[in-house]
Amino acid sequence: QPCPYPMAPPNGHVSPVQAKYILKDSFSIFCETGYELLQGHLPLKSFTAVCQKDGSWDRPMPACSIVDCGPPDDLPSGRVEYITGPGVTTYKAVIQYSCEETFYTMKVNDGKYVCEADGFWTSSKGEKSLPVCEPVCGLSARTTGGQIYGGQKAKPGDFPWQVLILGGTTAAGALLYDNWVLTAAHAVYEQKHDASALDIRMGTLKRLSPHYTQAWSEAVFIHEGYTHDAGFDNDIALIKLNNKVVINSNITPICLPRKEAESFMRTDDIGTASGWGLTQRGFLARNLMYVDIPIVDHQKCTAAYEKPPYPRGSVTANMLCAGLESGGKDSCRGDSGGALVFLDSETERWFVGGIVSWGSMNCGEAGQYGVYTKVINYIPWIENIISDF
């Protein structure tokens, strides 16, 4: 006896279409684009029913249910808005991701996603993955007038990238993105195999304040060209934090230098070093201090460190020097790893040009200069580490 004529479910069709279906005849159901076969709540790859000898089909008719992409994933440091309608997540629905204003900017795409037939929220560029809210770098409450000031107390928001590193000694670093710290290799060398021993603090001006944002290190990456106790060439390291920090006016990453950044770091251009290192009184500073210092001609700096007790070749092409010939303005012990920053007048963002590395035994000594790791030489190294890990 024939089986009942199969009625196609809404948004589906039967194939093949026959006048009647007898024993061993079969039909399949195909859904329109944007609809999927469901048996109950379970998706089916395909559906074929066979007519049995008792005149019944061997399987119940499935439904062609509209594809549902489901609630979109939360966007870290951002939000999502339903454009089509509140909570609408079905085929062709549109949502719009956006990043928290001021401190984050959207990377990858424009944040507009459509629910496609494959069940994925998909951007106009075809990406299935979430956009990225990347922290805006180089924002500071401070503006520079190009004058040289010395030993000033920092104000809230002046150096929001400043990181205090407590390990074996007091050192500094600068926040990159929201989960990396750029510092000097010599400052964290002892902790390279014990990253968790590093106590990392940010968002505070006072070195001893109990009010700070705590971060912990997941891994320490020291430049492979750095040799401890054999000079300071390649004195650069990256610390990966085990969690992203929340960006605000007191915690903001520093920018890495653009290719064009060298034009803002010529001899006599002013850079700013900040830290809690030794002051003229010989003690670690309680309050974050900063000093504006000019870049020194490389040959002049090399010559200054050619005489004993410094070994020949102490100053390499991977270093830059800053300070006054008359002395008095310098970084010092405890400032190690901190950023020497410059204002990119085109982007109006601060970027890290140098990392506090080494200098004369007596900080601020006349005729001697602070020596900083030249960050622009290490952009490929930094980018490789960050992209790989």
């Epitope: 469901l38 048996q39 709540h41 998706p43």
Partner: antibody, heavy 118, light 107 residues
Framework: QVQLQESGPGLVKPSETLSLTCTVS??????????WGWIRQPPGKGLEWIGS???????YYNPSLKSRVTISVDTSKNQFSLKLSSVTAADTAVYYC??????????WGQGTMVTVSS | SYELMQPPSMSVSPGQTASITCSGD??????AYWYQQKPGQSPVLVIY???KRPSGIPERFSGSNSGNTATLTISGTQAMDEADYYC?????????FGGGTKLTVLG
């Protein structure tokens, strides 16, 4: 993001009924997009699906357990529950609840260990 | 009742490709799902509907399913991928899990 948390007694006597509750936070159990499931894992062994429920009360059960299993839902508390009757030592396992979206379990609760022993 | 079979264990060197198989009668006709479970943790969905990857799952995880075999492939295997992997499918509205494969990353 949605989170699930299992709760209930860690020790049940043989022949008694095992009762567990899963509390859903960060999302509504009444969402039309989801079923909610129970899966268990005996110590050192693999996973076994027990059953799934929709917010309306519609259920699917594993045929091998169907005679002993009841899954229910309380939308007002954003919870769903498992009852397994006539338990034996073979029912000793970590019991997980999970969101069941069109057949895929994601995410899962942290699991709760239930020991059947007198 | 429907059964899914997996090799109990397999090992792979870091950076190499691991292919974990799951076999069942006409498995290719239905969707396969894969879960990763690390010691002491809950399972995590890594592949659904044969080859779809949930957000947050690295691109090195991929899946395929045809004939009687579904395969989870991990390319450029990392130490963090060491775990138990379970395949799962729905047969006649019944959820079925494979017995699991313990993946060891050498070194």
């Amino acid at each position: 993001q949605v989170q699930l948390q299992e709760s209930g007694p860690g020790l049940v006597k043989p022949s008694e009924t095992l009762s567990l509750t899963c509390t859903v936070s960060g999302g509504s159990i009444s969402s039309s997009s989801y079923y909610w499931g129970w899966i268990r894992q005996p110590p050192g062994k693999g996973l076994e699906w027990i059953g799934s429920i929709y917010y309306s009360g519609s259920t699917y059960y594993n045929p091998s357990l169907k005679s002993r299993v009841t899954i229910s839902v309380d939308t007002s508390k954003n919870q769903f529950s498992l009852k397994l009757s006539s338990v034996t030592a073979a029912d000793t396992a970590v019991y997980y609840c999970a969101r069941d979206r069109r057949g895929r379990f994601d995410p899962w609760g942290q699991g709760t260990m239930v020991t059947v022993s007198s | 009742s429907y059964e899914l079979m997996q090799p109990p264990s397999m090992s792979v060197s870091p950076g190499q490709t691991a292919s974990i198989t799951c076999s069942g009668d006409k498995l290719g006709d239905i969707y396969a799902y894969w879960y990763q479970q690390k010691p002491g943790q809950s399972p995590v969905l890594v592949i659904y509907q044969d080859n779809k990857r949930p957000s947050g799952i690295p691109e090195r995880f991929s899946g395929s399913n045809s004939g009687n075999t579904a395969t989870l492939t991990i390319s450029g295997t990392q130490a963090m991928d060491e775990a138990d992997y379970y395949c799962q499918a729905w047969e006649s509205s019944t959820g079925v899990f494979g017995g699991g494969t313990k993946l060891t990353v050498l070194g």
